[in-house]
C-alpha cells in the first residue's frame, strides 16, 4: 500500500510480489520524488485499490504500456 507522509508526496516502501491481471487495472501513476526511498508505480484497480509495483519489472512496464495504449485509442 502507498503511504502519504507530509502530503501530497506519496511513497512506496514495498512492492507487490504478485502479477496483477491488466483487466483489473484502471490507471497508474509514477512515483519519482527524491523524497521517496525508491522509484515506483502505483496502479489503481477497477475497485479503486492502490497497489505499489516495481517499475523495473516487465509485467509492470507492459501493463503501463497497455493502459497508455487504451487511453490513446478512442473507443468506437
Amino acid at each position: 500500500q502507498p503511504d502519504a507522509i507530509n502530503a501530497p508526496v506519496t511513497c512506496c516502501y514495498n512492492f507487490t510480489n504478485r502479477k496483477i491481471s491488466v483487466q483489473r487495472l484502471a490507471s497508474y501513476r509514477r512515483i519519482t520524488s527524491s523524497k521517496c526511498p525508491k522509484e515506483a508505480v502505483i496502479f489503481k484497480t477497477i475497485v479503486a485499490k492502490e497497489i505499489c509495483a516495481d517499475p523495473k519489472q516487465k509485467w509492470v512496464q507492459d501493463s503501463m504500456d497497455h493502459l497508455d495504449k487504451q487511453t490513446q485509442t478512442p473507443k468506437t
Epitope: K56, Q57, K58, W59, Q61, D62, D65, H66, K69, Q72
Partner: antibody
C-alpha cells in the same frame, strides 16, 4: 511472414552520431516491442533498450542512457536507434529484435531478430 | 542489475551426446528466462521462452527447465548443425541481461 530489416553497415568518426533503422513487416507494428541489443566482436550480448511503438514509451539500460535514443515511426513501421558521441567502445554489431507483451498474451521472448548492423568507429 | 552466470563457457562434444548448460541468476527471476542459439555470422535465434517453453518450430531435442535462480538448457542428442553459441537471458527485471554464452563445438 514477420521480418525485421536493418540498415546497412556504418563507418563513423569518433565523436559523431549515427542513426540505425529497423523496418518491420508481416505483423502489427504497434502491438509488439522493439528491443536493441549490442554485440561486440567475439563477445556476448548486451541489451540496450526497448520501445513500444503503440505508445512511444521507452525503457533503457542505465548503461546506455545518454548514449542511445530510441524512436519509432508508426506510418512506416520503422524503429530507430540513434547513438551519440561515438567512441571505439561503440564499435559493434547492433541487432533489433521483436518481443510481445506479457499482458496481451503475445509474449514469447525476443522471437524475431534483424540481421544486424555493423558500426565501426574509426578516425 | 541481475547477473546471469552461465556455465560452462565451452563444450566439446560428439554427435549423439547429451549436453546441459546451466544459468544461475543473482536473484530470483521467476520463470522469465529465455535461451538463444547464435550460429557463426548469424543473428541469435529464440529456442526457449518462459524457462521451459519450446518456441515454434524448435526441435524437441532442445529443452529448458528451472525456476527462481537456477536454470538448465539441455540438448538430448547433439547434431552437427547444433554448433553454435548458446545464451540464457532474463527479462524479469530491467535491464534485461544475458549470460556470457556457451560455445558448443563438435568433435
Amino acid at each position: 511472414q514477420v521480418q525485421l530489416k536493418q540498415s546497412g553497415a556504418e563507418l563513423v568518426r569518433p565523436g559523431a552520431s549515427v542513426k540505425l533503422s529497423c523496418k518491420a513487416s508481416g505483423y502489427t507494428f504497434t502491438d509488439y516491442y522493439i528491443n536493441w541489443v549490442k554485440q561486440r566482436p567475439g563477445q556476448g550480448l548486451e541489451w540496450i533498450a526497448r520501445i513500444y511503438p503503440g505508445t512511444g514509451n521507452t525503457y533503457y539500460n542505465e548503461n546506455f542512457k545518454g548514449k542511445a535514443t530510441l524512436t519509432a515511426e508508426k506510418s512506416s513501421s520503422t524503429a530507430y536507434m540513434q547513438l551519440s558521441s561515438l567512441t571505439s567502445e561503440d564499435s559493434a554489431v547492433y541487432f533489433c529484435a521483436r518481443s510481445g507483451s506479457t499482458v496481451v498474451g503475445n509474449y514469447y521472448g525476443m522471437d524475431y531478430w534483424g540481421q544486424g548492423t555493423s558500426v565501426t568507429v574509426s578516425s | 542489475s541481475i547477473v546471469m552466470t552461465q556455465t560452462p563457457k565451452f563444450l566439446l562434444v560428439s554427435a549423439g551426446d547429451r549436453v546441459s548448460i546451466t544459468c544461475k541468476a543473482s536473484q530470483s527471476v521467476s520463470n522469465d528466462v529465455a535461451w538463444y542459439q547464435q550460429k557463426p555470422g548469424q543473428s541469435p535465434k529464440l529456442l526457449i521462452y518462459y524457462a521451459s517453453n519450446r518456441y515454434t518450430g524448435v526441435p524437441d531435442r532442445f529443452t529448458g527447465s528451472g525456476y527462481g535462480t537456477d536454470f538448465t538448457f539441455t540438448i538430448s542428442t547433439v547434431q552437427a548443425e547444433d554448433l553454435a553459441v548458446y545464451f540464457c537471458q532474463q527479462d524479469y527485471s530491467s535491464p534485461w541481461t544475458f549470460g556470457g554464452g556457451t560455445k558448443l563445438e563438435i568433435k
